[in-house]
């Protein structure tokens, strides 16, 4: 049976290294819910589409979040 | 520096328990996912079981499953494999080894970190 | 259970020759999850490769990894002294995660 379809959270390891936006291929947030019960962060990176489980509670990952979410407000209209 | 050590092994009769001890330092020992990795002598490696980061999720390999439980104690640093009723086939070097930093059911870092080992011997 | 067979059992070479080591599954394995460890007698395992292709830190570049699907390949491009020991490659796409047998890369 595959893992993914047998566990309630994705992330094995969480990194606390900061990532480069510009190497970012795309960041999702997944809320918690009931099957996982804390947030998890997972980028895609530009490289190989390796995607990486991200510490919210990191200061360089919160720092991430906000230049992200400062550069999409931009873009919006 | 990054380091892993592996304790508890020794010698013990078929049935009984053991509990082995594995001390993580140089690292945030909270974030990463953990293993037990076993090696009977003179053959290859064998997955035991593996434990996410924060403790709640845990998966072991079908010759150890309702026998071996792995924890860890996220405040000292530590992670545990208790293995009972204890087969002559358990022998083998026990390594503990760390998942790599950002690992997920959609990319893995491979097991980045080991430990030393320690060597379980179950004989009558 | 995946079942991951490496080919061959042994492999005699000489120091500056080209080695490559096959892991086949039985099973389509995505290269996302694909790992190869090299292991010398007395030794914890290291981490060679991870992702079936990139290679994990202060892994020299001779090391490289290719393949997908069922079919992996670890290639040692010009065989160093250090370099003969056992390599094993795993899967941690399912659970359980498993090991290939190994390959002993040995002097001829």
């Known amino acids: 049976i595959p893992l993914s379809r047998t566990v309630r959270c994705t992330c094995i390891s969480i990194s606390n290294q900061p990532v480069n936006p510009r190497s970012l291929e795309k960041l999702e947030i997944i809320p918690p819910s009931q099957f996982c019960p804390h947030v998890e962060i997972i980028a895609t990176m530009k490289k190989k589409g390796e995607k990486r489980c991200l510490n919210p509670e990191s200061k360089a990952i919160k720092n991430l979040l906000k230049a992200v979410s400062k550069e999409r407000s931009k873009r919006s209209p | 520096q990054v380091q892993l050590v592996e304790s508890g092994g020794g010698v013990v009769q078929p049935g009984r328990s053991l509990r082995l001890s594995c001390a993580a330092s140089?690292?945030?020992?909270?974030?990463?996912?953990m293993h037990w990795v076993r090696q009977a002598p003179g053959k290859g490696l064998e997955w035991v079981a593996v434990?996410?980061?924060?403790?709640?999720?845990?998966y072991y390999a079908d010759s150890v499953k309702g026998r071996f439980t792995i924890s860890r104690d996220n405040s000292k640093n530590t992670l545990y494999l208790q293995m009972n009723s204890l087969r002559a086939e358990d022998t083998a070097v026990y390594y503990c080894?760390?998942?790599?930093?950002?690992?997920?059911?959609?990319?893995?870092?491979?097991?980045?970190?080991w430990g030393q080992g320690t060597t379980v011997t179950v004989s009558s | 259970e995946i079942v991951l067979t490496q080919s061959p059992g042994t492999l005699s070479l000489s120091p500056g020759e080209r080695a490559t080591l096959s892991c086949r599954a039985s099973?389509?394995?995505?290269?996302?999850?694909l790992a190869w460890y090299q292991q010398k007698p007395g030794q914890a395992p290291r981490l060679l490769i991870y992702?079936?292709?990139s290679r994990a830190t202060g892994i020299p570049g001779r090391f490289s990894g290719s393949g997908s699907g069922t079919d992996f390949t670890l290639t040692i491009s010009r065989l160093e002294p250090e370099d003969f020991a056992v390599y094993y490659c795993?899967?941690?796409?399912?659970?359980?995660?498993?090991f290939g047998q190994g390959t002993k890369l040995e002097i001829k």
């Open positions: 099973q389509s394995v995505s290269s996302g999850h």
């Open positions: 992702g079936a292709s």
């Open positions: 140089g690292f945030t020992f909270s974030s990463y996912g």
């Open positions: 434990i996410w980061f924060e403790g709640s999720i845990k």
């Open positions: 795993q899967q941690y796409g399912s659970s359980p995660y498993t």
């Open positions: 080894a760390r998942e790599g930093a950002g690992s997920s059911l959609y990319y893995y870092y491979g097991m980045d970190v």
